[in-house]
């Protein structure tokens, strides 16, 4: 899915107002020094790309996270601001129907957010203008 | 638990530089923007720039263009600012202040660099 | 460069009165404005972001609201520790620009 046509501003406050409450909670108990953040992106639409497949791609040591509440509401922000965002999705969801996992929480996961977290925060910055 | 400690006060002439530190603790320094501020006696928030520490790329304001210089030692967690050819106008309290967990905010701040310029 | 205005420049009043603090932006910036509190000698702190999302440990008396170009910070009721100075800076672009700043005194 190419994020370019997406409404940044709208899906910006969205994850201020909800998303990033959710991460956090998920991450209580982790050291702030514990990650460095390794996962990068270039601009906002680049971001979107990189934090949609980190929350709903399963990874070794980490299948879990698409079923998180950060997961299923940044699902529902990308589906309500980004123009034909669910019809891409259908496919994708049917297929993570058939590979439900139990919920756990291991150290891998919680890196993986810790960079979402990351990801998250370069997607927000402000443009970075230079004089 | 978070904190920006910054160095102590200058006294400087005109047409000296100062350079202003800021050490970080308490969170991964390389993960997070810092931006400075100063705020002359009696006067308002005048935004300077910001630095990545990780990659060491900076955004000034137009205004210090060409007098700042913000550079960030990984090794020490330490960002400093660098303002040369000092005029009495720059007498201020400067502050550093880490970026925010969500991007969208500067939320813990250093206590602040009080510098005089005088003759 | 976006500039940012603040009003009213100070503004007296008594604890428990209900204040409202106004800033404007002089292009859209949607929703990126915070608001910060400072008291004489202090570093200013964070209290509002994304233009009405409350920062963790701030009461609850004070509140965001506003988007495009008009924000407003308001305390519902003031408490004696609430006299300071409340500046917004926009955050949609950079320079990030302050506002020129509230002193909030008692009447």
């Known amino acids: 899915y190419d994020f370019t046509n997406c409404d940044f501003e709208k899906i910006k406050a969205a994850y201020l107002s909800t998303i990033s409450k959710d991460l956090i909670t998920y991450m209580s108990g982790t050291k702030s020094t514990e990650f460095n953040n390794t996962v990068s992106c270039s601009n906002r639409p680049h971001c979107l790309t990189e934090i949609q497949s980190l929350t709903f791609n399963p990874t070794a040591g980490c299948a879990s996270l698409a079923k998180e509440m950060f997961a299923m509401k940044t699902k529902a922000a990308l589906a309500i601001w980004c123009p034909g965002y669910s019809e891409t999705q259908i496919n994708a969801t049917q297929a993570m129907k058939k590979r439900r996992k139990r919920k756990v929480t291991t150290n891998k996961c919680l890196e993986q957010v810790s960079q979402l977290q990351g990801l998250w925060r370069r997607f927000n910055r402000p443009l970075l203008k230079q004089q | 638990q978070v904190q920006l400690v910054q160095s102590g006060a200058e006294v400087k002439k005109p047409g000296a530089s100062v350079k202003v530190s800021c050490k970080a603790s308490?969170?991964?320094?390389?993960?997070?923007?810092i931006e400075w501020v100063r705020q002359a006696p009696g006067q308002g928030l005048e935004w300077m720039g910001i630095?990545?520490?990780?990659?060491?790329?900076?955004y000034y304001a137009q205004k210090f263009q060409g007098r700042v210089t913000m550079t960030a030692d990984k090794s020490t967690s330490t960002a400093y600012m660098e303002l040369s050819s000092l005029r009495s106008e720059d007498s201020a309290v400067y502050f550093c202040?880490?970026?925010?967990?969500?991007?969208?905010?500067?939320?813990?701040w250093g206590q602040g660099t009080t510098l005089t310029v005088s003759s | 460069d976006i500039q940012m205005t603040q009003s009213p420049s100070s503004l007296s009043a008594s604890v428990g009165d209900r204040v409202t603090i106004t800033c404007r932006a002089s292009?859209?910036?949607?929703?990126?404005l915070v608001w910060y509190q400072q008291k004489p000698g202090k570093a200013p702190q964070l209290l509002i972001y994304?233009?009405?999302n409350l920062q963790s440990g701030v009461p609850s008396r004070f509140s965001g609201s506003g988007s495009g170009t008009q924000f407003t910070l308001t305390i519902s009721s003031l408490q004696p520790e609430d006299f300071a100075t409340y500046y917004c800076?926009?955050?949609?672009?950079?320079?990030?620009?302050f506002g020129t700043g509230t002193k909030l005194e008692i009447k």
């Open positions: 800076q926009h955050f949609y672009e950079t320079p990030l620009t």
């Open positions: 994304g233009a009405r």
């Open positions: 202040a880490k970026e925010s967990l969500t991007g969208s905010s500067y939320d813990y």
């Open positions: 308490g969170y991964a320094f390389t993960n997070y923007l």
């Open positions: 630095i990545n520490p990780e990659s060491g790329d900076t």
């Open positions: 292009e859209n910036i949607y929703s990126n």
